[in-house]
């Protein structure tokens, strides 16, 4: 029932334009190029878009014509390294060019830029966008797929042509709509909050297969789709890891038209599958491809069968686990973990991981032991901390989160985190504390039985967002060791560590707390992130500050910002109450 | 712990064939991929081919493909490199390695920790 198996192509470009149509070809060699040469501008890339096409079309008509045998990599890398200002433009990116395939795509794959410089995305007046959607809807829309793929090179694509659909939908009523606005701009805002989210849930995939490979990348399907879909046999679950392992593969590594052609296959096999998958497959197999794929990819979990036995006769009383475990350990394994988390979808998948790594490790001792069964029979027992610490850690957090609200929930967090490791940039803190701080409206309003697959899986996807971002310039031996030591054991290695005792204060200066009116013109996010920024500043020139201390100074800051926004010489105010808050504040800290 | 150990270099004429062998002992499990690398003299370390040794799915360097075959004996734990048509090119000393993880870029000689001390393949005439 292997879904991948193809005959082999004469030309393989040729292949996959006939599987993908022309839009969906075109749309998905832009977004590989936009991922690749994020710096190049939209007319370049849609020229060298264009040239691939008509090469494709080609090569459709006769695929035995000049150059259709070469790979995909072969035919988009000759195509990049043709840009003329490829050195002057990415530096040492342009010596992937003197190597040959597969060692130049994998150059290529390892500049991508987890934060490029690139201007912010400013939103023009609706109208203005209006006029540019009527105007060349295709242009427009193009510019939406470029814009998105520069920005998160690691971008699903399969997925980005889900959220250009939506877009397009967008535009299209709203357009027409008798108050615009009113119409666009929150779908908008939901597009981009939900893309930022599905460009973080990637990335960890992504950085999963990069930094820890296959094997880890597989255990974690295993256990996420056995919760999905606890109805389902092992044979059946390891078919779909194995499918699915082989997509996100190829999305990561830039095979963008072999991953959306897979990725619709699985969705067929799911489909026609779903009486032994799951019973919550209904509705979105009745939907159009794209839709399709991403309902399958967010389904809720299936209801657990009944009567499902004790774990405990085949993994832990059973004579038979030693030779289970020796004949076979992969698949041992993999079946346990099935085992435990269809029966767990209380759990975090990180937490299933860590109970099954636990379990290994017992295995690999015992079974090496005078007597095994005797040494790994309280194993289960050695799972009880396990659980508990992500269950407390959720517990304190939430009611923290309720009783402070998402703001100052986030200020706590920042002030944790920025004592923790003081010399990771200060965005970098302000970007990743807001967002573990998100944590709280997420996933506190769940009900206990859904708390911690929520918190503890989102708080993966936010810390991998710190791990990429301080890989590019590491400047903390102690978010490198955590980052690297263990992917599951990530968020218990940040939560353990106390305040860096080796961290020489920030020298202060007064520059940096110094503010202008136009703080008074940012929305309201805008002006918290000024806030926050000068938190993280605040803590990294008195990291021994106490909260209290803290406190006082951010809601000193808080009045100053809302008098001197009041005052009819903003300017003026910001000047002369500016100098007054920082001798306060110096001296509130003791600085 | 792995340990590789190459063998089957050696001096051979342009267009000639060569078959090499590494031997892997300690624990290689199926989620292993194993790769040859080679290294000329003055030049940077260069990735030749790879083969997860789960599903025996393969990748080769452009300018061997179609002349070199990467292959592996499960039961001997032997990996093999059989290369045809030798050009002087190819002059290089030739390596084993191990990814037990099978890491996503399988071209980097950084993602395998475990490398066998190479072995001589000279082409000439």
């Known amino acids: 029932r292997g879904v991948f198996r193809r005959d082999a192509h004469k030309s393989e470009v040729a292949h996959r334009f006939k599987d993908l149509g022309e839009e969906n070809f075109k749309a998905l060699v832009l977004i590989a190029f936009a991922q690749y040469l994020q710096q190049c501008p939209f007319e370049d890339h849609v020229k060298l878009v264009n040239e691939v096409t008509e090469f494709a079309k080609t090569c459709v008509a006769d695929e035995s014509a000049e150059n259709c045998d070469k790979s995909l990599h072969t035919l988009f890398g000759d195509k990049l390294c043709t840009v003329a200002t490829l050195r002057e433009t990415y530096g040492e990116m342009a010596d992937c060019c003197a190597k040959q395939e597969p060692e130049r795509n994998e150059c290529f794959l390892q500049h991508k830029d987890d934060n490029p410089n690139l201007p912010r995305l400013v939103r023009p007046e609706v109208d203005v966008m209006c006029t540019a959607f009527h105007d060349n809807e295709e242009t427009f829309l193009k510019k939406y797929l470029y814009e998105i793929a520069r920005r998160h090179p690691y971008f699903y694509a399969p997925e980005l042509l889900f959220f250009a659909k939506r877009y397009k939908a967008a535009f299209t009523e709203c357009c027409q709509a008798a108050d615009k606005a009113a119409c666009l701009l929150p779908k908008l805002d939901e597009l981009r909050d939900e893309g930022k989210a599905s460009s973080a849930k990637q990335r960890l995939k992504c950085a999963s297969l990069q930094k820890f490979g296959e094997r880890a990348f597989k255990a974690w399907a295993v256990a996420r789709l056995s919760q999905r879909f606890p109805k389902a046999e092992f044979a059946e679950v390891s078919k779909l890891v194995t499918d699915l392992t082989k997509v996100h593969t190829e999305c990561c590594h830039g095979d963008l038209l072999e991953c959306a052609d897979d990725r619709a296959d699985l969705a067929k096999y799911i489909c026609e599958n779903q009486d032994s998958i799951s019973s919550k497959l209904k509705e979105c197999c009745e939907k159009p491809l794209l839709e399709k794929s991403h309902c399958i990819a967010e389904v809720e979990n299936d209801e657990m069968p009944a009567d499902l036995p004790s774990l405990a006769a085949d993994f832990v009383e059973s004579k038979d686990v030693c030779k289970n475990y020796a004949e076979a350990k992969d698949v041992f394994l993999g079946m346990f973990l099935y085992e435990y988390a269809r029966r767990h979808p209380d759990y975090s998948v990180v937490l299933l991981l860590r109970l099954a790594k636990t379990y290994e490790t017992t295995l690999e001792k015992c079974c090496a032991a005078a007597d095994p069964h005797e040494c790994y029979a309280k194993v289960f027992d050695e799972f009880k901390p396990l659980v508990e610490e992500p269950q407390n850690l959720i517990k304190q957090n939430c009611e923290l989160f309720e009783q402070l609200g998402e703001y100052k929930f986030q200020n706590a967090l920042l002030v944790r985190y920025t004592k923790k490791v003081p010399q990771v940039s200060t965005p970098t803190l302000v970007e990743v504390s807001r967002n573990l701080g998100k944590v709280g409206s997420k996933c506190c309003k769940h009900p206990e039985a859904k708390r911690m697959p929520c918190a503890e899986d989102y708080l993966s996807v936010v810390l991998n967002q710190l791990c990429v971002l301080h890989e590019k310039t590491p400047v903390s031996d102690r978010v490198t060791k955590c980052c690297t030591e263990s992917l599951v054991n990530r968020r218990p290695c940040f939560s353990a560590l106390e305040v860096d005792e080796t961290y020489v204060p920030k020298e202060f200066n007064a520059e940096t707390f110094t503010f202008h009116a136009d703080i008074c013109t940012l929305s309201e996010k805008e002006r918290q992130i000024k806030k926050q920024t000068a938190l993280v500043e605040l803590v990294k020139h008195k990291p021994k500050a106490t909260k209290e201390q803290l406190k006082a100074v951010m809601d000193d800051f808080a009045a100053f910002v809302e008098k001197c926004c009041k005052a009819d010489d903003k300017e003026t105010c910001f000047a002369e109450e500016g100098k007054k808050l920082v001798a306060a504040s110096q001296a509130a800290l003791g600085l | 712990e792995v340990q590789l150990v190459e063998s089957g270099g050696g001096l051979v004429q342009p267009g000639g064939s060569l078959r090499l062998s590494c031997a892997a002992s300690?624990?290689?499990?199926?989620?292993?991929?194993m790769g040859w690398f080679r290294q000329a003299p003055g030049k940077e370390r260069e990735f030749v081919s790879a083969i997860n040794w789960s599903d025996g799915r393969t990748v080769y360097l452009d300018s061997v493909k179609g002349r070199f075959t990467i292959s592996r004996d499960n039961a001997k734990n032997t990996l093999y490199l059989q290369m045809n048509s030798l050009r002087a090119e190819d002059t290089a000393v030739y390596y084993c390695a191990a990814d037990p993880d099978s890491r996503l870029y399988y071209t980097v000689p950084q993602n395998y920790d475990y490398w066998g001390q190479g072995t001589q393949v000279t082409v000439s005439s």
């Open positions: 300690g624990r290689t499990d199926s989620a292993y991929r």
